[in-house]
Interface confidence: low
């Protein structure tokens, strides 16, 4: 879309009166402490708010919490603390909200020192009523719901027991001791690691990986010498210690741990780590840390089995284990990911891929921006996006990049325009085409959110001073209106809107401070009268995603197909509505070499689409471990990219021969696994 207008412009008629009639204030009868907010269910309008306040006394800390409930998207709240017997709720466990629209809520209470176990409050009617339950253990983690059945809960105890409930927390059973980490898999399966010699830390690299498919009646050991494990898409990953030294390697299973294959990834040493950046049912992005305290590593993308990996991006910024990475899945357009690299001069630059990691490029410079002081050439520079790393470095970045699957093409992020990320105060940029082009949307840092599937964008300036103004745009951030939502400014703490970006309500949270006291306050604004009518067919326009060259017959082809979307015209001021479904028309593309990744032992030279044999492997038989057997690979170097739907065109041939020999390097071969029943 054309740039040209960056500041406010007259657009929506009589919006002040319309918004004033739909602005709802709620002052919470609370001393300021911390506040947490959760939506219960989808499109139910139910919000739970937990406020907690700690009073440090001489010998101990006295805590008080209050629970509030709204059933109209935050316009009105009712104090329901009495439903939980005025008990102090532990905020570190948050509010455990059940999956989908189960209406289930679990709150974990603080209990006095000598008690036998913890206490929870359970609701299965969207927090209208709660049942108090005393636990036979002290929880170490929040209750975890099975994704398939919200009556099934698991939790770890402070004594490392794995506890399971089959009746939504009414009755609990310890199914295993000495457990370090537990996760739900598919079909109510639980995966967990156990230690033998005293503690999780002491046994790191000597843990066992277990599986139960019947909630603890029977178990199977599916891995030994385990350092850690993770689930991503349909893949189960384990990092496994090598026999001879302190290195470890990734093994992968696609059958819940029955059989394992060694991933063709570099091994890592004690100080290094692996990290699953993103995974779906087709493939996985894996980060492999560089040796030494470099702060970077390499991104690899997998084949459809999670075994063969292609190098995707070098010098990928990722600080120490559990540290920060800017890797972001742009959910508003298929195949798009954004992340940061650490360049040789230690500056940080943003990179984007439009084809699921096949190629990475810099972000195009916004047309309405100048290159900043980081740019060597004032006419040539890129947009660099602030994400988790910038936030961790306490730069003036209040929010990470934002995209929503139902707001097609829209990406909003803080950024700077130059040769690298700048420490100067950032501005907010928007892309309406999934990251191909960008426009400066707002000057200076802001909080932002998307409403009505992109029909409205709301923003609030990030300021240390109290605020009373909200900005909104009905044309994807081109033009902005400002609305004063209260006469008395508040210290702003957060914007809250229902997850999924379908709502037309936004809640502004903050606190008022007077000489004597400070109180939590929320303002909920409903934009329904700004978007007065429902959108009609004429309000939408056809948009070809990933279009870069309209003259090219294959324009828009990514991963073997192109998609045309019906998108709301920027000029249309109307409601997409809560039932809005993204309308897209896919069409299959002809295969080209771009639709194939390089097979094991092959690589793509820069700026070349052909896969060539790795020099060090030339003339050698390509052998690798698959399901615990050694495989002999006969290949011309190509393998179809996972999820690629192309047909016809070029079709490289590939063949795998089974050598029927055992893999000595596979620590997770089937005969090392055993089963037992309780």
């Amino acid at each position: 879309s054309a740039p040209g207008e960056d500041e406010e412009c007259g657009r929506v008629r009589d919006f002040v009166a319309k918004l004033a009639n739909n602005t709802h204030q709620h002052v919470f009868d609370d001393l300021r402490g911390s506040v947490s907010l959760s939506w219960v269910g989808d499109s139910t309008g139910v919000i739970l708010v937990l406020t907690t306040f700690h009073v440090p006394l001489v010998i101990m800390t006295f805590g008080q919490s209050k629970l509030y409930r709204s059933e109209d998207y935050g316009k009105n709240f009712k104090d329901i603390t009495d439903l939980i017997n005025n008990t102090f709720i532990r905020t570190e466990f948050g509010m455990a909200i059940g999956p989908e629209n189960s209406g289930k809520v679990v709150l974990t209470a603080e209990v006095s020192g000598g008690s036998r176990g913890g206490r929870i409050f359970r609701s299965s009617d969207f927090a209208k009523n709660f049942v108090q339950t005393d636990l036979p253990f002290h929880p170490l983690t929040q209750m975890m719901y099975s994704p398939q059945n919200s009556d099934y809960l698991l939790a770890l105890s402070t004594e490392n027991g794995l506890w399971v409930s089959k009746n939504f927390g009414g009755k609990w059973e310890e199914i295993h001791k000495a457990v370090c980490l537990a996760k739900w898999g598919s079909d109510n399966t639980i995966f967990f690691t156990t230690y033998a010699n005293g503690s999780c830390k002491a046994d790191l690299g000597a843990l066992e990986l277990w599986r139960t498919s019947d909630l603890g009646k029977s178990f199977k050991t599916i891995g030994v010498k385990i350092y850690s494990f993770g689930l991503g898409g349909r893949f189960l990953f384990a990092s496994v210690m090598a026999d001879k030294d302190t290195t470890r390697r990734i093994h992968v299973s696609t059958d819940q741990g029955d059989t394992w294959s060694m991933a063709q990834l570099p091994s890592v040493g004690q100080e290094q780590f692996y990290s699953i950046l993103a995974a779906n049912d087709d493939m996985v992005f894996m980060h492999v840390d560089e040796p030494g305290d470099t702060g970077f590593g390499t991104i690899f993308t997998s084949d459809d089995r999670g075994i063969v990996y292609s190098k995707s991006l070098d010098r990928h910024l990722y600080t120490t284990t559990g540290g920060e990475t800017d890797f972001t899945n742009v959910t508003s357009l298929r195949g798009v990911y954004i992340t940061s690299v650490l360049s040789e001069d230690n500056s940080i630059q943003t990179m984007i891929t439009f084809d699921q990691g096949g190629r990475w490029t810099h972000l195009r410079k916004p047309e309405n921006s100048e290159c900043d002081a980081t740019a060597k050439n004032k006419n040539e520079c890129s947009l660099h996006i602030h994400a988790s790393y910038s936030i961790s470095q306490k730069l003036n970045v209040p929010m990470a990049p934002l995209s929503e699957p139902n707001a097609v093409g829209i990406v909003i992020a803080h950024g700077s325009v130059g040769d690298a990320i700048s420490v100067m105060v950032p501005d907010v940029y928007i892309s309406d085409d999934g990251g191909y082009s960008w426009t400066k949307m707002l000057e200076g840092p802001h909080y932002y959110t998307i409403l009505d599937s992109g029909g409205i964008i709301v923003a609030i300036e990030h300021s240390s001073r109290p605020i009373n103004v909200i900005k909104f745009s009905t044309d994807e951030g081109q033009c902005w209106q400002t609305y004063t939502f209260t006469r008395d400014p508040i210290y702003f703490t957060g914007l809250a809107s229902e997850p999924g970006a379908r709502s037309m309500n936004i809640s502004i949270w903050g606190f008022t401070e007077s000489f004597l006291t400070s109180q939590w306050v929320s303002y909920t604004i409903d934009f329904k009268d700004i978007l007065e009518r429902n959108c009609e067919e004429k309000d939408y326009t056809i948009w070809l995603a990933h279009s870069t060259d309209p003259e090219d017959y294959e324009d828009g082809c990514i991963l073997g197909y192109k998609e045309q979307f019906l998108r709301l015209r920027k000029s249309s001021v109307c409601q997409n509505g809560r039932d809005y479904v993204v309308t897209k028309q896919p069409s299959i593309c002809l295969c080209s070499l771009e639709d194939f990744l390089c097979d094991f032992g092959y690589y793509r030279p820069e700026n070349d689409s052909k896969c060539v044999e790795q020099p060090e492997l030339k003339g050698h038989d390509l052998e690798f471990c698959l399901y615990g057997r050694e495989e002999h690979l006969t290949t011309n170097g190509y393998r179809k990219i996972p999820g690629d739907k192309c047909q016809g065109g070029v079709n490289p041939v590939r063949e795998v021969k089974d050598l029927k020999k055992k893999c000595t390097s596979n620590f997770l071969s089937p005969e090392k696994q055993n089963s037992k029943s309780n």
Partner: antibody, heavy 118, light 107 residues
Framework: EVQLVESGGDLVKPGGSLKLSCAAP????????MSWVRQTPDKRLEWVAI????????YYSDTVKGRFTISRDNAKNTLYLQMSSLKSEDTAMYYC???????????WGTGTTVTVSS | DILMTQSPSSMSVSLGDTVSITCHAS??????IGWLQQKPGKSFKGLIY???NLKDGVPSRFSGSGSGADFSLTISSLESEDFADYFC?????????FGGGTKLEIK
């Protein structure tokens, strides 16, 4: 009523300079982007330059880049076009145009004539 | 630059007729096109924006269609005040470019 009134057009020698103004009463000038567009004697239209509502951003056509400068004074509700190193091909009727939130040629002025001739 | 090819350059029509003017963009511009009217000796008036949207106050006998690279302006049941010059303009990317114009004359 929204109206735009251009002034400053004149006969000028090649290489000379001229400054055009566009007065913009009748609407909140500071919230709109503004453009200059010219119409040559053969009636062809050519977009010249655009400036954002706050004046932070300007864009030019390649034919005038480096010679013309678009600016605005929001306090005076006035848009300007400073033209220098004028050429005979700059001879045209110059119009200012308002960029609304919908699109970029929403309201037009009445025009002012610039003739570059020796 | 995007070249906007407008046709016809002129046409003679009668009152009450329906006419269509077309504009072809040298590359896809989605629906970032507007249509303008210029009466003899006068300035310009915006008629249509984003390809199909009628500007407030413009009679409903004017309509726009098309998207991508081919667009048209249709005027149904012509009235005397409609005899004027018409121009298309693309604002998909800088520099904004105009069609050569169509002169509508009374037959």
């Amino acid at each position: 009523e929204v109206q735009l009134v251009e002034s400053g057009g004149d006969l000028v020698k090649p290489g000379g300079s001229l400054k055009l103004s566009c007065a913009a009463p009748g609407f909140t000038f500071s919230t709109y982007g503004m453009s200059w567009v010219r119409q040559t004697p053969d009636k062809r239209l050519e977009w010249v330059a655009i400036i954002s509502s706050g004046g932070s951003y300007t864009y030019y056509s390649d034919t005038v880049k480096g010679r013309f400068t678009i600016s605005r004074d929001n306090a005076k509700n006035t848009l300007y076009l400073q033209m220098s190193s004028l050429k005979s091909e700059d001879t045209a009727m110059y119009y200012c145009s308002r960029s609304s939130s919908h699109w970029y040629f929403d309201v037009w002025g009445t025009g002012t004539t610039v003739t570059v001739s020796s | 630059d995007i070249l906007m090819t407008q046709s016809p350059s002129s046409m003679s029509v009668s009152l009450g007729d329906t006419v269509s003017i077309t504009c072809h963009a040298s590359q896809g511009i989605s629906s970032n096109i507007g249509w303008l009217q210029q009466k003899p000796g006068k300035s310009f008036k915006g008629l249509i924006y984003h390809g199909t949207n009628l500007k407030d106050g413009v009679p409903s006998r004017f309509s726009g269609s098309g998207s991508g690279a081919d667009f048209s302006l249709t005027i149904s049941s012509l009235e005397s005040e409609d005899f004027a010059d018409y121009f298309c303009v693309q604002y998909a990317q800088f520099p904004y470019t105009f069609g050569g114009g169509t002169k509508l004359e009374i037959k």
